[in-house]
Interface confidence: low
Amino acid sequence: IWELKKDVYVVELDWYPDAPGEMVVLTCDTPEEDGITWTLDQSSEVLGSGKTLTIQVKEFGDAGQYTCHKGGEVLSHSLLLLHKKEDGIWSTDILKDQKEPKNKTFLRCEAKNYSGRFTCWWLTTISTDLTFSVKSSRGSSDPQGVTCGAATLSAERVRGDNKEYEYSVECQEDSACPAAEESLPIEVMVDAVHKLKYENYTSSFFIRDIIKPDPPKNLQLKPLKNSRQVEVSWEYPDTWSTPHSYFSLTFCVQVQGKSKREKKDRVFTDKTSATVICRKNASISVRAQDRYYSSSWSEWASVPCS
Amino acid sequence: RAVPGGSSPAWTQCQQLSQKLCTLAWSAHPLVGHMDLREEGDEETTNDVPHIQCGDGCDPQGLRDNSQFCLQRIHQGLIFYEKLLGSDIFTGEPSLLPDSPVAQLHASLLGLSQLLQPEGHHWETQQIPSLSPSQPWQRLLLRFKILRSLQAFVAVAARVFAHGAATLSP
């Protein structure tokens, strides 16, 4: 058993049929010594008396808010949550496996630049009685500070018969050094509580590996005289690290016909312009990637050819 | 060429070669497309590689103030990785074909380090750790990790030289 926060405790249980469970001793936070009784949740049934209560925690029915009273007055509470371990593996019932980029990916994170700011998100099908708490650091043995905000519900989607809820959180490294080569990864820890079930999820990454620039901005076409060619130009996204002479991007320019089956013409360039042939009903798209480190490409920015 | 306290390096040449190094580091890794590194586990690892850290002066402001600190650090890293790529980890079984990206990477690391340091002048270099993998699979894992860390190192070096070529070239 360990303390998650004040008056909230997590009991770690091996979860299998007829498991013995864990013996837990609760102590009433009071100077009083006698006349103390204990109840669980809203029930008025007295579970025991005395300053301490010993219980065998085996299942969710044994978890909940234990309250000690004296003469009708509440003295203190202890909320017991359960953390299940099945076949040696901690349960992951609350969050959905996103399966990208690999199986057992519950948390996904992205950064728009090297400033030390990043966003993580996760999915669940649970709509109520759900709380999240997020902590982060750089490195684990001698951790350096990363400050995370509160997790918020950022999207709702319907998937077949189910509703899916996306939560996200923004974090910022306290003393970020954008130009340095990271040697210790960022660690992100999410505590999830659904009713009386506790689970924790972790992710470890370097900012450089989760970089995904915003799409290029101000995408424009300029027809060239007496030619089917056009000059496409664009700018670095506002959110990208500066100076651009140091934090450089490379770009992919694509000409795509109306039909998905039509052959795509692609050009790669380090410049912020390119000359391409504009076909009728086609569109021109540009995306960006860090020039020197192969992290994710941005989403496409597009304009129609006409 | 970068002599401590002396003249500037050939920024444009360094920029071109460091960008080539980035391309090579990514084409060389993974050496086989069939290795799936999930979690690092407790296998032998490469913690001792030199990293370009915050105080090394490789940020735009530090380069403007005095690029020598950063160039010395980059040089040290290039020599370190050049030695690693020439060690038993990369020369042992399973052996690499002579035209593999690793062979080109090795040559380019040497080329860039020589651009930064003329003959006869010696900056202090870091000892390479004694990583002696016992069998081919461990060698593959070490190659994988070394190349992954080299990708991060050469990305910073390439940014330094790109910025230098754009803003510090005479």
Partner: antibody, heavy 117, light 109 residues
Framework: QVQLVQSGAEVKKPGESLKISCKGS????????IGWVRQMPGKGLEWMGI????????WYSPSFQGQVTISADKSISTAYLQWSSLKASDTAMYYC??????????WGQGTLVTVSS | DIVLTQPPSVSGAPGQRVTISCTGS?????????VHWYQQLPGTAPKLLIY???KRPSGVPDRFSGSKSGTSASLAITGLQSEDEADYYC?????????FGGGTKLTVL
Amino acid sequence: QVQLVQSGAEVKKPGESLKISCKGSGYSFSNYWIGWVRQMPGKGLEWMGIISPTGSVTWYSPSFQGQVTISADKSISTAYLQWSSLKASDTAMYYCARWYYKPFDVWGQGTLVTVSS
Amino acid sequence: DIVLTQPPSVSGAPGQRVTISCTGSSSNIGSGYDVHWYQQLPGTAPKLLIYGNSKRPSGVPDRFSGSKSGTSASLAITGLQSEDEADYYCSSWTPSSVVFGGGTKLTVL
């Protein structure tokens, strides 16, 4: 003594999933990689892939990449080979073998997998 | 597709010497990769016979020896005995996997 003990023979239908195991004993499991080798009826040996003792690195033969999954659980000194959807052509004897300084110096007894409708 | 070529069968009388060849290419044996040999007795799992071109694991009689030259390797068995009747496989590397030869059936006449 040093041995690798494999799970028993399996008879399956096409499309079914299967996971076979290979348990090491009598040596330090965490020093050795475990490889899997297929032998189709009356045919030669084919290397499928190998896994590090912690299960953190798998390396597949190009011919088997995406066809099978190799995993390991160091805590119980066991390596696994699994299929999500078997085909009749997966009918074969499957051997596990350990690799350290010497290549595949100890082999399991083999698991015969028969896939037939 | 087999990238190491072995003769499908060889035979010899008891007491004789036989050799089994294993021919590769510049992308496996010729690249400096080691060659290993395995023996598979009927109905049993393979057993390591020779590793690192010519090294014998403990317990393997010195009647078995291996050698390698250029892009090929060979296994020699002297003083042939009836219990040597088995399939023999050579093995090496390519840049992307371990490869086995097609196997050679040794018959003791």
